[in-house]
Amino acid sequence: KSSNEATNITPKHNMKAFLDELKAENIKKFLYNFTQIPHLAGTEQNFQLAKQIQSQWKEFGLDSVELAHYDVLLSYPNKTHPNYISIINEDGNEIFNTSLFEPPPPGYENVSDIVPPFSAFSPQGMPEGDLVYVNYARTEDFFKLERDMKINCSGKIVIARYGKVFRGNKVKNAQLAGAKGVILYSDPADYFAPGVKSYPDGWNLPGGGVQRGNILNLNGAGDPLTPGYPANEYAYRRGIAEAVGLPSIPVHPIGYYDAQKLLEKMGGSAPPDSSWRGSLKVPYNVGPGFTGNFSTQKVKMHIHSTNEVTRIYNVIGTLRGAVEPDRYVILGGHRDSWVFGGIDPQSGAAVVHEIVRSFGTLKKEGWRPRRTILFASWDAEEFGLLGSTEWAEENSRLLQERGVAYINADSSIEGNYTLRVDCTPLMYSLVHNLTKELKSPDEGFEGKSLYESWTKKSPSPEFSGMPRISKLGSGNDFEVFFQRLGIASGRARYTKNWETNKFSGYPLYHSVYETYELVEKFYDPMFKYHLTVAQVRGGMVFELANSIVLPFDCRDYAVVLRKYADKIYSISMKHPQEMKTYSVSFDSLFSAVKNFTEIASKFSERLQDFDKSNPIVLRMMNDQLMFLERAFIDPLGLPDRPFYRHVIYAPSSHNKYAGESFPGIYDALFDIESKVDPSKAWGEVKRQIYVAAFTVQAAAETLSEVA
């Protein structure tokens, strides 16, 4: 049954009332308000915005709104000693320097405290040497360089284009290859869509625009100095040498005008194939070093950024549940931005603000949700998901016992083509049912449902007539809730057409040009896509907090487990001889998946038939649903990644943004043909199959009849 059975309900107080209260014009106003100055984590401006949001959430009617502060490791450029890269001649003279900052967008020329482009947490250093172009710096790019082309990156400065994978993975790969510095740049092939003007005339990246971002490899640790525990007043902090995930070599980002000057002189090997060529008028030679006439010139990095323990502030709002106040549905998104945050994060924060206002309006009229809803404005997401992770570490005991679901609310848009959803399989049916009830904002789909336009534009690759829903990866604040704590999670936003726009993310991501005007002029002038995202996110929260039976379908987990087992088995079967030699069998995993499928099916039948008027039985069934996600958590975590504990999903070891299924087995199999000790390697594969099979079986048993 749905929400209209919720507590204190009157005909007026249902999902429709909540959705009808959401207004595009309010989201627009909130976005404007949140984007007039920078809100960098750890700054006074972001503290002031936290207090403003606290005050407004109270006005909107939440029961309580508190600030939760932590002292975490952040990173900033040196104000008097700017970071830059130069080309130096044989005498050591700088004959070319990269930009010190981006040219400001129109109307923002007099804004102070715009942080110049930098790679957060880069160590200081002034390495100089020959350049090697490493494409996207993915694992496979370094394989191509080292194994096929026999190019050694040791002692070289590598230049990599942004895109395809998380920048932290690029830096980790470069470090492992022996590089002594990394230059990251935005190639027009990835950040300039054909036929669109650059900002301020369109939504493309100008030549002087640069993507900021952290380059950590935290693997879910949160604050690098206090892994596993909150960075509170009495925290024990590691020394910087023991800090988690910090890069060991200097890193700096540049725009494509500056990249042109570095790449145009490149000599050495030609690019291995066309996939290594971007859109600049340069040869994309790999190097090492510059061509003939310029061979005595070197590249020098000048990096002077500092790491500093700094106070950050989350805003936590509570709307107490009327029936199950000890069950928490969380809606959270970050507040800190690199500069103005026109899209990331404020297009999401503005939507959260309007959702809070709508819930508050209903509450003022006497309504309460069945379960408690927690609203969060996270700090320091851009510096490694720090605010959300520290809060979850501080409240982990409550969350693991009471956490029903977490809905993420970062950027509401990355395009204006169709909906994009990543979530636990438990939420598939919730998302399908909700989007069938919402109107599509898309041109050509007037009067049609969101489900219909979404399915048409982004069809599921497996199931006809259904939309694509992706796996959760990481790179956002749901990470600690899903990957560490096993709380069912989901995220939704409007996206671009991935078929026609192959660029990575959106072109102005993390640049100074991510302004209110970018959104209002080019992405969503009517704020209709923002409103739709508010309806999806808010609608999911409403249903999760209000429906008598939790809107989770465990049968959908059974379906994907079978698909993931088939996939990992087929990867393993690329090595049939070794599987035979080392007696590798997936029987236990397939058996566990079969058992899960049968038990989930029976549970779903019982769910239809049980007496919902019996509060004890209702609570028991809901707890089985709530704790199902938790059952996929292995307390020991994944190998070398103790904070990634979900056995079914983890961020890819090669790209933090992407989700990998059965990650323990996947990583054990990855590049196994190159392992020096095959017996040991295949032994680890067998161990990971065992862990996965056990976990799936154990999870299945949580759905069995209790006695």
Partner: antibody, heavy 119, light 107 residues
Framework: QVQLVQSGAEVKKPGASVKVSCKAS????????MHWVRQAPGQGLEWMGY????????RYAQKFQGRVTMTRDTSTSTVYMELSSLRSEDTAVYYC????????????WGQGTTVTVSS | DIQMTQSPSTLSASVGDRVTITCRAS??????LAWYQQKPGKAPKLLIH???SLESGVPSRFSGSGSGTEFTLTISSLQPDDFATYYC?????????FGQGTKVEIK
Amino acid sequence: QVQLVQSGAEVKKPGASVKVSCKASGYTFTDYYMHWVRQAPGQGLEWMGYFNPYNDYTRYAQKFQGRVTMTRDTSTSTVYMELSSLRSEDTAVYYCARSDGYYDAMDYWGQGTTVTVSS
Amino acid sequence: DIQMTQSPSTLSASVGDRVTITCRASKSISKYLAWYQQKPGKAPKLLIHSGSSLESGVPSRFSGSGSGTEFTLTISSLQPDDFATYYCQQHIEYPWTFGQGTKVEIK
């Protein structure tokens, strides 16, 4: 090849208006900004403003706000700069110059139009 | 507005000389500085943009350097065709502003 051809010299009385044209050829007209820069006799260069033919946006230097208007005729790939309420200090050579984008330097210039303001 | 100050105002030099002109900005303009050459009765001609990027067709004896607030234009070996007035201009922030010019004349 890229060419910016400006209209001929003008002599105007104080208080009058002048409209100088700049006809572009050899490139896609709407892909480039058009700037106007003036130079008083024996003096340096002074930026007056730009016109963006892609979206008809203009930006004028504070000094000329309210007196200058920049327009276009797409059919002839021509940009116009009109300066009103002329005074003797407006006697100068007026140049149009194009730039690739909002942040790019002016790579091609017109030959200049001499405007003399005299009673 | 950003003030641009050039020095010297006039420079006397001979063919073959190495010539350096300095341009200072009243606040940091990163590397967004252009240099133009103007001959009497002619329109300015772009030599260098973004501090050090040589415009195509401009002889390699012209070079630009600098970052932040201090920039220089260098002519490595002055040629007869180089006697002209040179202007710097910041192209990072509107209104765009020029230096007052440096006249390079024959010694």
